[in-house]
């Protein structure tokens, strides 16, 4: 991997960025696990989905998530109207019509049923991290990443570049 990109310090939020195409550039079905190899699982409870971070029993099947990749313009921080290159954004869908959403008020990660076009809360900047890991930065809240807290997914504020290697915001994607 290229290593770790630093924390987005721009005053202009990532939600000023524009998704170049309405349709994804590619899609990828993968299981999602933490840096410490705990699995991210999804369970239907009382007509809504809950997200868990847990150790699976041997031979227990991992839940899969559909990652849809989008190309996006990255807003320039210094020239108000400039565009500063390209980024890759993803949406994550564990089951039909449900997507991971960033709830910035509650600092939580939730599964919401919604129709396309998806809201900005469903988009995450994908970071290519060291040790074959990735991280997911909220489009709507730069510097805030999906992370693990108390065996659940939560939104975690990363306040400096050095903290980007914190294990609780690192995830592994695998086809198996």
């Amino acid at each position: 991997a290229f290593g770790i990109s630093g924390v987005q310090k721009y005053t202009r939020a990532l939600h000023d960025s524009s998704i170049t195409g309405i349709s994804p550039i590619t899609e990828y079905l993968a299981s999602l696990s933490t840096y410490n190899d705990q699995s991210i699982t999804f369970a239907l409870e009382d007509e809504s989905y809950e997200i868990y971070v847990e150790d699976l029993k041997k031979d227990e099947k991992k839940d899969k998530v559909l990652l849809s990749y989008y190309e996006s313009q990255h807003p320039s921080n210094e020239s108000g109207d400039g565009v500063d290159g390209k980024m890759l954004m993803v949406t994550l869908s564990p089951t039909k019509d449900f997507w991971l959403h960033a709830n910035n008020k509650e600092h939580s990660v939730e599964l919401h049923k919604c129709e396309k076009p998806l809201p900005d809360q469903a988009f995450f900047v994908l970071h290519n991290m060291h040790s074959n890991c990735v991280s997911f930065e909220c489009k709507t809240d730069p510097g805030v990443f999906i992370g693990v807290k108390d065996n659940h997914l939560a939104l975690i504020k990363v306040d400096s570049s050095e903290n980007l290697c914190t294990e609780n915001i690192l995830f592994k994607l695998s086809e198996t």
Partner: antibody, heavy 119, light 111 residues
């Protein structure tokens, strides 16, 4: 405007040392992974080294490991390449490059600085 | 390390013609469902310029006549109709893993 300006190149004898600098402007420097890529005269491109945005990780091509050190000073918006025990085969134009936001590819390149290793 | 082989070494064409450049990797450059293969253009005395990232996506400000395709180990850069400013050297590069490697380049020259 995003800009990378390299300096510090020149003529040096085999076994000598040189420190290259890259001054960055027009973007939040600390937010990006930075690299050095070189090109020998009339030849192709070769990746040399990368440093992550948090200074947490560095990677090098095998041929320079133990001789070259990549570093950065985010307060000065500067990238460096300390080159020791230089060899004739290190003669090249050295480009400073910035990854895209998210670290997937080399997106921005400087104009380069020429390093000549010769007796 | 992943070795990238470009062909042909030189392509002699006239303005307005279609250019097709090939890049073959010694192993798959796919990671996380992405083909991490990029294309750069370099003119004499200038630094390289990003044309295509992740196999098929144009960099900022790159004209629509440039397109990329392919997956796994075989990739193609196509210039649909050559403009005078397109005569240059083109490099493919993989960003799947360290060491990041480049192809040896294809020179597109005026016939």
């Amino acid at each position: 405007e995003v800009q990378l300006v390299e300096s510090g190149g020149g003529l040096v004898k085999p076994g000598g040392s040189l420190r290259l600098s890259c001054a960055a402007s027009g973007f939040t420097f600390s937010s990006f992974s930075m690299s050095w890529v070189r090109q020998a005269p009339g030849k192709g491109l070769e990746w040399v080294a990368t440093i992550s945005g948090g200074k947490t990780f560095t990677d090098y091509v095998d041929s320079v490991k133990g001789r070259f050190t990549i570093s950065r000073d985010d307060a000065k918006n500067s990238l460096y390449l300390q080159m020791n025990s230089l060899r004739a085969e290190d003669t090249a134009v050295y480009y400073c490059t910035r990854a895209n936001y998210g670290d997937w590819f080399f997106e921005v390149w400087g104009q380069g600085t020429l390093v000549t290793v010769s007796s | 390390e992943i070795v990238l082989t470009q062909s042909p070494a030189t392509l002699s064409l006239s303005p307005g013609e279609r250019a097709t450049l090939s890049c073959r990797a010694s192993e798959s450059v796919a990671k996380y469902g992405l083909s991490l293969l990029n294309w750069f253009q370099q003119k004499p005395g200038q630094p390289p310029r990003l044309l295509i990232f992740a196999a098929s996506n144009r960099g900022s400000g790159i004209p629509a006549r440039f397109s990329g395709s392919g997956s796994g180990t075989d990739f193609t850069l196509t210039i649909s109709s050559l403009e005078p400013e397109d005569f240059a050297v083109y490099y493919c590069q993989q960003s799947k893993e360290v060491p990041f490697t480049f192809g040896q380049g294809t020179k597109v020259e005026i016939k």
